[in-house]
Interface confidence: medium
């Protein structure tokens, strides 16, 4: 037997697990595909990315809208020559998410 | 040219990207390795898991301490035989994290 309070708690948790934009730590270099002689400090930034659960296994949490936000980072060249330079780096920020079908696989692939 | 205020903003963001326990959505069935004829509703729960950035590429964010927390979920058997039952499910919750060296690779692997 279960009471309404227990169900409310379960429902609230479920709502929180749903597919939605959530703050995520992303590695800037991987994002930008920068050359190996340039790196960024901090190496990671916080942005919103789609994540969470979908009701069905055939669905995945995908972004439906994206904005690009500018983060101030130190761009450092190796070997170090000048004082590290602050540069604006644009990183994708997911603003909308939806549970969408995974891309159908070709029967012969 | 950058001022101290800019550096403070960067520093605050960097602190937030550090390796630490962060709320994550995990799929219960995968966690428990349950048989395919049993599934849970909600299928996902929120727990804390280690995540975030480490200063060096050779380090990864790993859990150093774990507690197990109980989540009330509906366990449903397929085919449905009885009323879904609320069961307590224990899920790992990371309480401490550290940037640790990745396992050294065997030279012949």
């Amino acid at each position: 037997f279960y009471d309404i309070e227990t169900l409310k708690v379960i429902d609230e948790e479920w709502q929180r697990t749903q597919c939605s934009p959530r703050e995520t730590c992303v590695e800037v270099a991987s994002e930008l595909g920068k050359s190996t002689n340039t790196f960024f400090k901090p190496p990671c930034v916080n942005v919103f990315r789609c994540g969470g659960c979908c009701n069905e296994e055939s669905l995945i949490c995908m972004n439906t809208s994206t904005s690009y936000i500018s983060k101030q980072l130190f761009e450092i060249s190796v070997p170090l020559t000048s004082v590290p330079e602050l540069v604006p780096v644009k990183v994708a920020n997911h603003t909308g998410c939806k549970c969408l079908p995974t891309a159908p696989r070709h029967p012969y692939s | 040219f950058y001022d101290i205020e800019t550096l403070k903003v960067i520093d605050e963001e960097w602190q937030r990207t550090q390796c630490s326990p962060r709320e994550t959505c995990v799929e219960v069935a995968s966690e428990l390795g349950k048989s395919t004829n049993t599934f849970f509703k909600p299928p996902c729960v929120n727990v804390f898991r280690c995540g975030g950035c480490c200063n060096e590429e050779s380090l990864i964010c790993m859990n150093t301490s774990t507690s197990y927390i109980s989540k009330q979920l509906f366990e449903i058997s397929v085919p449905l035989t009885s009323v879904p039952e609320l069961v307590p499910v224990k899920v790992a919750n990371h309480t401490g994290c550290k940037c640790l060296p990745t396992a050294p690779r065997h030279p012949y692997s």
Epitope: S77, L80, T81, S82, V83, E85 | F1
Partner: antibody, heavy 117, light 112 residues
């Protein structure tokens, strides 16, 4: 408000080691991207960059003087220390502590160090 | 090391008249990131150097607009459109593109 102040002996003898301390306020050397460095200026001459230290303890030295210089920091005390070994009369100069940004904006007032027997 | 050569060494000026200082580097100051880290400082008598111009032509906050910087590659110029009495002192150019960061020998500006 950012301030930097140098302290150390006004007079050192040849072959001795010079130890200079920079005490700063208005910022922290634990802040991401922050650096503190040293620049000197012999009387009536040009400025010469010596060394600097970054928030994560990376250190950079002028290659010409590298073997004689050591820079270190005490973040909790807001201090950076420069030591220079085997002092010579040609090292007589005003030594400035600077906050390292690109370019140098905040400088200490400088401390004159004379090397003489 | 990058050698920074300033001319003239001394510059006697009349208040209200323009003044120009040249700075030449022994190597291009264009960084691989595209920026040129050439800066100008003024050291007034008995004081620490103060930043006037950064990255060739950007006036630092509070610096009067009579000061301007120009140039590229290895040749740079600081201009004062109308010299004032408070502008006396030694002007230094400086590069922070290449380690070690280096300074010019200075140009002493004095009132005639």
């Amino acid at each position: 408000q950012v301030t930097l102040k140098e302290s150390g002996p006004a007079l050192v003898k040849p072959t001795q080691t010079l130890t200079l301390t920079c005490t700063f306020s208005g910022f922290s050397l634990s802040t991401y991207g922050m650096g503190v460095g040293w620049i000197r200026q012999p009387p009536g001459k040009a400025l010469e960059w010596l060394a600097n230290i970054w928030w994560e303890d990376d250190k950079y030295y002028n290659p010409v003087l590298r073997s004689r210089l050591t820079i270190s920091k005490d973040t909790s005390k807001n201090q950076v220390v420069l030591t220079m070994t085997n002092m010579d009369p040609v090292d007589t100069a005003t030594y400035y502590c600077v906050q390292v940004t690109n370019p140098f904006v905040f400088w200490g007032e400088g401390t004159l160090v004379t090397v003489s027997s | 090391d990058i050698v920074m050569t300033q001319t003239p060494l001394s510059l006697p000026v009349t208040p209200g008249e323009p003044a120009s200082i040249s700075c030449r580097s022994s190597q291009s100051l264009v960084h691989i990131n595209g920026n040129t880290y050439l800066h100008w400082y003024l050291q007034k008598p008995g004081q620490s150097p103060q930043l006037l111009i950064y990255k060739v032509s950007n006036r630092f906050s509070g610096v009067p607009d009579r000061f301007s910087g120009s140039g590229s590659g290895t040749d740079f110029t600081l201009k004062i459109s109308r010299v004032e009495a408070e502008d006396v002192g030694v002007y230094f150019c400086s590069q922070s593109t290449h380690v070690p960061w280096t300074f010019g020998g200075g140009t002493k500006v004095e009132i005639k």
